[in-house]
Interface confidence: low
């Protein structure tokens, strides 16, 4: 028996369902009584889900997994993982045994989009050219960790005096805070881009300083 899985990682959004595809080619006359199917975590060998002795043995992993019982006889051994969490990320191995056996591993990459950044300015009044200001760009609840880029109004990257911190909450999602310290020109726009490298999702925020008032 030959097991086939996706070569590419499966990307799943947090709180959505993911399908880890696994298939085999059943011989003519194959019946489910012959099938032993085991899904496990590749690294720890922890059992995730199994089908043995002609029946679905159920989920051994947070009660959030399911097979596709009607499709098993056709060679579809895929696993459905419900309400994906950050901690589900990793490699899963699909073992199929009929007379002989084969296995293959598929990677699950968890992702969550970042929120539109909020921009704050300190100080936020009595601003004059030559003043040093601190602009903070904050974006929330993303995964994995973000890449943060700053640009001025002409699109020129601002790399000096940037400090970015990222902190995971109890769900493993990251809140990103990036601080730019800059000397004000006569007027200017400062843009922050928060990129999720897995989703290739960009979230933009900007602040324009033209004397008073400020535009966010």
């Amino acid at each position: 028996v030959e097991v086939q899985v996706s070569e590419d990682p499966v990307v799943a959004l947090v709180d959505t369902d993911a399908t880890l595809r696994c298939s085999f080619s059943p011989e003519p006359g194959f019946s489910l009584a012959q099938l032993n199917l085991i899904w496990q975590l590749t690294d720890t060998k922890q059992l995730v889900h199994s089908f043995t002795e002609g029946r679905d043995q159920g989920s051994a992993y947070s009660n959030r997994t399911a097979l596709f019982p009607d499709l098993l006889v056709q060679g579809n051994a895929s696993l459905r993982l419900q309400r994906v969490r950050v901690t589900d990320e990793g490699s899963y191995t699909c073992f199929v045994s009929i007379q002989d056996f084969d296995s293959a591993a598929v990677s699950l990459q968890v992702a969550a989009p970042y929120s539109k950044p909020s921009m704050t300015l300190e100080p936020n009044k009595d601003l004059r050219p030559g003043n040093m200001v601190t602009i903070t760009c904050s974006s929330y609840q993303g995964y994995p960790e973000a890449e943060v880029f700053w640009k001025d109004g002409q699109g020129v990257p601002l790399t000096g005096n940037v400090t970015t911190s990222q902190m995971a909450n109890e769900r493993g999602l990251f809140d990103v805070h990036s601080v730019l310290r800059v000397v004000l020109g006569a007027n200017g726009t400062y843009s922050c881009l928060v990129r999720n490298p897995v989703l290739q999702q960009d979230a933009h925020g900007s602040v324009t300083i033209t004397g008073q008032p400020l535009t966010f």
Partner: antibody, heavy 122, light 108 residues
């Protein structure tokens, strides 16, 4: 410049302990899987341990060091560690830290430190 | 664990010659293989990943091929700086990540 710099190698007696450090610079350390790889004198490369970026930082070990070595990372300090306990003569080697080629994956290592030498001998 | 067997152990060639290094896996690793170069007293350097993709800054004379269990690293025309030890490494099935025993390319 992307750089890894190991330290902490020393001469230690069998049964002793040592902690190696690997200081990273020039890249977003917290986004990359990291590994420790060693090379005994005149021998080939042997993967020792790896640590993920995932929530909780999953750690992985070669059978030869499991239960004796502990890998950890401090993303706030951009530093990777290897705590080595119950050291044996066969642990004598140059220890390298390596960074995975691309963020969020564990595959091949494109950035290596210069290595730090651990000698276990009485 | 997956065992990688490299051959030959030593390859004696002259500058300008073509070098062909082999790496065999104990079971299929699809294309999940990397090649490294190591010179005496230095850290390894990544040459090839994904069996055939050149790493950043690696000259075109280095090429990788193969999938499943049989892999080849080819250096089309050896330069003086290419004489070194070459290792293959698999990342299809881990832990552990495993390396081959190495092939030394020396000057004839």
């Amino acid at each position: 410049e992307v750089q890894l710099l190991e330290s902490g190698g020393d001469l230690v007696q069998p049964g002793g302990s040592l902690r190696l450090s690997c200081a990273a610079s020039g890249f977003n350390f917290s986004s990359y899987w990291m590994s420790w790889v060693r090379q005994a004198p005149g021998k080939g490369l042997e993967w020792v341990s790896g640590i993920s970026i995932s929530y909780g930082g999953n750690a992985y070990y070669a059978d030869s060091v499991k239960g004796r070595f502990t890998v950890s990372r401090d993303n706030s300090k951009n530093t990777l560690y290897l705590q080595m306990n119950s050291l044996r003569a066969e642990d004598t080697a140059v220890y390298y830290c390596g960074r995975d080629r691309s963020p969020y994956q564990y595959r091949s290592m494109d950035v290596w430190g210069q290595g730090t030498t651990v000698t276990v001998s009485s | 664990e997956i065992v990688l067997t490299q051959s030959p152990g030593t390859l004696s060639l002259s500058p300008g010659e073509r070098a062909t290094l082999s790496c065999r896996a104990s079971q299929s690793i699809r294309s999940d293989l990397a090649w490294y170069q190591q010179k005496p007293g230095q850290a390894p350097r990544l040459l090839i990943y994904g069996a055939s993709s050149r790493a950043t800054g690696i000259p075109a004379r280095f090429s990788g091929s193969g999938s499943g269990t049989e892999f080849t690293l080819t250096i089309s025309s050896l330069q003086s700086e290419d004489f070194a030890v070459y290792y293959c490494q698999q990342y299809n099935n881990w832990p552990p990540l495993t390396f081959g025993g190495g092939t030394k390319v020396e000057i004839k």
